[in-house]
């Protein structure tokens, strides 16, 4: 759905959520370009790019939530993701620097699409919550009550360490979106909240 407008059609909205999470779990859209741009595309360096435990809710945790709780948790987590992506973007090389280094400008464009994509997903999460009559969910553009703070990178002047932290975060993000996608794929054909 376009930002600010909500579809009233449950299956179309669920389809959009399924499509968005399908695309967002694809590492070629975010993690892989990040690795190339940051010069981490070397086997020994890639080994250090592991997901940090606890950075994102596990699939088991998400499955334990009802639809309402799941959407609220997803909304809050996406809020954190938006903050972290903004931080990552600030430390990306500029387009002209990429060209001088012989790196692919398309990789930078993919990274710059991440935040708009997350905003689009968050809007649809909000729309789905409305459709399921979750009146107390915070609008996607506002800070939520009890919304967890974005995971703060370890304070460091080490540029290399920051790159690895970004890499770990993105790996966790893709895994999280994979879990979210699996949950959405199990949602039934009717918006009946009792069916999970």
């Amino acid at each position: 759905a376009a930002m600010g407008s909500c579809s009233k059609e449950y299956r179309m909205l669920l389809g959009q959520l399924q499509k968005q999470t399908d695309l967002m779990q694809d590492t070629s859209r975010l993690l892989d370009p990040y690795i190339r741009i940051q010069g981490l595309d070397i086997p020994k360096l890639r080994e250090h790019c592991r997901e940090s435990p606890g950075a994102f809710p596990s699939e088991e945790t998400l499955r334990g939530l009802g639809r309402r709780g799941f959407l609220q948790t997803l909304n809050a987590t996406l809020g954190c993701v938006l903050h972290r992506l903004a931080d990552l973007e600030q430390h990306l090389p500029k387009a002209q620097d990429l060209e001088r280094s012989g790196l692919n400008i398309e990789d930078l464009e993919k990274l710059q699409m991440a935040r708009p994509n997350v905003l689009g997903l968050r809007n649809n999460v909000y729309c789905m919550a409305q459709l399921l009559d979750n009146s107390d969910m915070t609008e996607p553009t506002k800070a939520g009550r009890g919304t967890p703070q974005p995971p703060t990178p370890t304070p460091t002047s080490d540029v290399f360490q920051r790159k690895l932290e970004g890499c770990s975060f993105l790996r966790g993000y893709h895994r999280f979106m994979h879990s979210v996608g699996r949950i959405f794929s199990k949602w039934g054909e009717s918006p009946n909240r009792s069916r999970r």
Epitope: A2, R11, M12, G188
Partner: antibody, heavy 120, light 106 residues
Framework: QVQLVESGGGVVQPGRSLRLSCAAS????????VHWVRQAPGKGLEWVAV???????DYNAAFMSRFTISRDNSKNTLYLQMNSLRAEDTAVYYC??????????????WGRGTLVTVSS | EIVLTQSPATLSLSPGERATLSCSGS?????MYWYQQKPGQAPRLLIE???NLASGIPARFSGSGSGTDYTLTISNLEPEDFAVYYC?????????FGQGTKLEIK
């Protein structure tokens, strides 16, 4: 090989009914959404209806009162029952499948279509 | 419903040239889908999710765009590419198609 084959088209008088069939092979209708899309002669494409893997249905509001989508799982066949036909329903009717088990409203496999002509 | 307007209605080019087909929505959409249709045949999916090539589609086809404006580009026209092309959205109910762009040999 995934295939869709439509049948049941022909010439019919205005106000009469017709039932189109779409035989699916290479996949099960209970695993995918399958749609009807129509195309009037020399015109563009128009989505008509879908039946999802669990059996729920969605319609284009323009056809909801006159058209009914259904399926027979044992025959792996999709149907479109068209009532109170009008001259403007003259078109090639295609069945087309969604690309996976999610609620995706686009189409990766199409049948060859069956022509319905509504004329007195 | 979202109305998709394709331009130009007809595009006359020669093999080897580059074709740029546009699709504009009356409202913003999340993703765009493109189909090719030859006379007497069913449509064939070319591009899904705005920019992803469908299975078996040659790399000379590419898609781009966001919001209300989307583009299908065919970089090096082959004789078999001359056909009608349709865009489609399903961000808003019901799914709708553009009216088509006919790509013909000059």
């Amino acid at each position: 090989q995934v295939q869709l084959v439509e049948s049941g088209g022909g010439v019919v008088q205005p106000g009469r009914s017709l039932r189109l069939s779409c035989a699916a092979s290479g996949f099960s209708l209970t695993n995918y959404g399958v749609h009807w899309v129509r195309q009037a002669p020399g015109k563009g494409l128009e989505w008509v209806a879908v039946i999802w893997r669990g059996g729920s249905t969605d319609y284009n509001a323009a056809f909801m009162s006159r058209f009914t989508i259904s399926r027979d799982n044992s025959k792996n066949t999709l149907y479109l029952q068209m009532n109170s036909l009008r001259a403007e329903d003259t078109a090639v009717y295609y069945c087309a499948k969604s690309p996976n088990s999610n609620f995706y409203w686009y189409f990766d496999v199409w049948g060859r279509g069956t022509l319905v002509t509504v004329s007195s | 419903e979202i109305v998709l307007t394709q331009s130009p209605a007809t595009l006359s080019l020669s093999p080897g040239e580059r074709a740029t087909l546009s699709c504009s929505g009356s409202s913003s959409v999340s993703y765009m889908y493109w189909y090719q249709q030859k006379p007497g045949q069913a449509p064939r999916l070319l591009i899904e999710d705005t920019s992803n090539l469908a299975s078996g589609i040659p790399a000379r086809f590419s898609g781009s765009g966001s919001g209300t404006d989307y583009t299908l580009t065919i970089s090096n026209l082959e004789p078999e590419d001359f056909a009608v092309y349709y865009c489609q959205q399903w961000s808003s109910y019901p799914p709708t198609f553009g009216q088509g762009t006919k790509l013909e040999i000059k």
